[in-house]
C-alpha cells in the first residue's frame, strides 16, 4: 500500500516471547510523508486499550520508516499482555494491530525456555 496516509506496520496477531528481568523494546514502525504524527502506546484490558502515560518511549529514524519504541527496562511479569500503537494524523486516529507479549518469569538462566516451549504454554491465550 503506497499512499501518503500514515501506516502503522505491526503485523496482525504478532507475538513475542520475552523474559522478565531483561530489557525489551517494542517497536511500532510508522510510515508517514511529511510531518511525523503523534504516536502513543496503549495496553489492552478486555476491549479497552489503556493509554500508557508514564512509560519511557523514543523515536528511531531510518531512511524509509520511523519506529516509535516502548521501552521495558526491565521487563516485569505484569507486562504480559497485548499492546497497540495509535497515531493522530489530520485529526484521524489510526490504530495498529495488537501485538502480544508473553512474559516468562525466569528463576535462573538455566531454566530459560525456548521460543517453541513458550508457544506451548497452556496459559497463553489465543
Amino acid at each position: 500500500k503506497e499512499s501518503c496516509d500514515v501506516q502503522l506496520y505491526i503485523k496482525r496477531q504478532s507475538e513475542h516471547s520475552i523474559l522478565a528481568g531483561d530489557p525489551f523494546e517494542l517497536e511500532c514502525p510508522v510510515k508517514y510523508c511529511a510531518n511525523r504524527p503523534h504516536v502513543t502506546w496503549c495496553k489492552l484490558n478486555g476491549t479497552t486499550c489503556v493509554k500508557l502515560e508514564d512509560r519511557q518511549t523514543s523515536w528511531k529514524e531510518e531512511k524509509n520508516i520511523s519506529f516509535f519504541i516502548l521501552h521495558f527496562e526491565p521487563v516485569l511479569p505484569n507486562d504480559n499482555g497485548s499492546y497497540r500503537c495509535s497515531a493522530n494524523f489530520q485529526s484521524n486516529l489510526i490504530e495498529s494491530h495488537s501485538t502480544t507479549l508473553y512474559v516468562t518469569d525466569v528463576k535462573s538462566a538455566s531454566e530459560r525456555p525456548s521460543k517453541d516451549e513458550m508457544a506451548s504454554r497452556p496459559w497463553l491465550l489465543y
Epitope: 500500500k1 506496520y9 505491526i10 503485523k11 496482525r12 504478532s14 507475538e15 513475542h16 516471547s17 476491549t47 494491530h97 495488537s98 521460543k115 517453541d116 513458550m118 508457544a119 489465543y126
Partner: antibody, heavy 119, light 112 residues
Framework: QVQLVQSGAEVKKPGSSVKVSCKAS????????MYWVRQAPGQGLEWIGR????????RYAQKFQGRATITADESTSTAYMELSSLRSEDTAVYYC????????????WGQGTLVTVSS | DVVMTQSPLSLPVTLGQPASISCRSS???????????LNWLQQRPGQSPRRLIY???KRDSGVPDRFSGSGSGTDFTLKISRVEAEDLGVYYC?????????FGQGTKLEIK
C-alpha cells in the same frame, strides 16, 4: 511476484525425523507469516503451525506440539519444518505457504513435499 | 478448536450452470478488529491449493469474477456463477481468526 520453492520428496523410517525447507522469493519474509499444512493421501488439509520470521516466534496446532519445529532463516528467506518421531500416519504432502502479515493481501503456497514414512 | 463444516461434500454440476458451497463455523469468525478472516481455497487435481477469496468476499488477484464469497459470523457461502471446466477440483473454506487455523473437509466439484 511471491513464490515458494520446497525441498524434494523424502522417504523416512518410522521413529526418524524429517526436515522440509521452503524458500521464498519476491517478498521480504519479515513482513509475512509462513505456515505449514499437510495433506494425507486422498484427505483434506491440516494446519501444523506458523512462524513469524521477524522474531522467530512459532505457534503450533496442539496435535503437533512437541513433535513439529518450525524455524526461519531471514538471511536466506527460508522456512523449515521438522517433524520428529515419524509414524506411518505422517505420510502426506507437506505444504508451506506465506501470507502478508499486515493486510493479508497475498497468500501463496509452495508446490508441496511428499514425505513417505515406511519401514 | 473451531470446527469448519462444509456442505455438500460432493457437488456434481453441469458446465455453464451456477454452483454454491456452504461453510459453517462452530463459533463466530468476527475478529476484534471488526474483520472476519474466512478464506476459500481451490485445489485442482494434482496441484497445490491456491487462495481464491479472503476476508469473506475479497477476490485474490487473477481470480475470475464468476467466483464470489459472502456471509458473516458463522455462515459463509462460495458461489460460482457459471462453472467452467477449469473450476473442477476441491474447494476448502478455512478460518484465520483463531488459533489453531482450521479447514473445512472440502467440497469436490465434479461434472454431472
Amino acid at each position: 511476484q511471491v513464490q515458494l520453492v520446497q525441498s524434494g520428496a523424502e522417504v523416512k523410517k518410522p521413529g526418524s525425523s524429517v526436515k522440509v525447507s521452503c524458500k521464498a522469493s519476491g517478498v521480504n519474509i519479515k513482513d509475512t507469516y509462513m505456515y505449514w499444512v499437510r495433506q494425507a493421501p486422498g484427505q483434506g488439509l491440516e494446519w501444523i503451525g506458523r512462524i513469524d520470521p521477524a522474531n522467530g516466534y512459532a505457534r503450533y496446532a496442539q496435535k503437533f506440539q512437541g513433535r513439529a519445529t518450525i524455524t526461519a532463516d531471514e538471511s536466506t528467506s527460508t522456512a523449515y519444518m521438522e517433524l520428529s518421531s515419524l509414524r506411518s500416519e505422517d505420510t502426506a504432502v507437506y505444504y508451506c505457504a506465506v501470507y502478508d502479515g499486515y493486510y493479508e493481501s497475498f497468500d501463496v503456497w509452495g508446490q508441496g513435499t511428499l514425505v513417505t514414512v515406511s519401514s | 478448536d473451531v470446527v469448519m463444516t462444509q456442505s455438500p461434500l460432493s457437488l456434481p454440476v453441469t458446465l455453464g450452470q451456477p454452483a454454491s458451497i456452504s461453510c459453517r463455523s462452530s463459533q463466530s469468525l468476527l475478529d476484534s478488529d471488526g474483520k472476519t478472516y474466512l478464506n476459500w481455497l481451490q485445489q485442482r487435481p494434482g496441484q497445490s491449493p491456491r487462495r481464491l477469496i479472503y476476508l469473506v468476499s475479497k477476490r485474490d488477484s487473477g481470480v475470475p469474477d464468476r467466483f464470489s464469497g459472502s456471509g458473516s459470523g458463522t455462515d459463509f457461502t462460495l458461489k460460482i456463477s457459471r462453472v467452467e471446466a477449469e473450476d473442477l477440483g476441491v474447494y476448502y473454506c478455512w478460518q484465520g481468526t483463531l488459533f489453531p487455523r482450521t479447514f473445512g473437509q472440502g467440497t469436490k466439484l465434479e461434472i454431472k
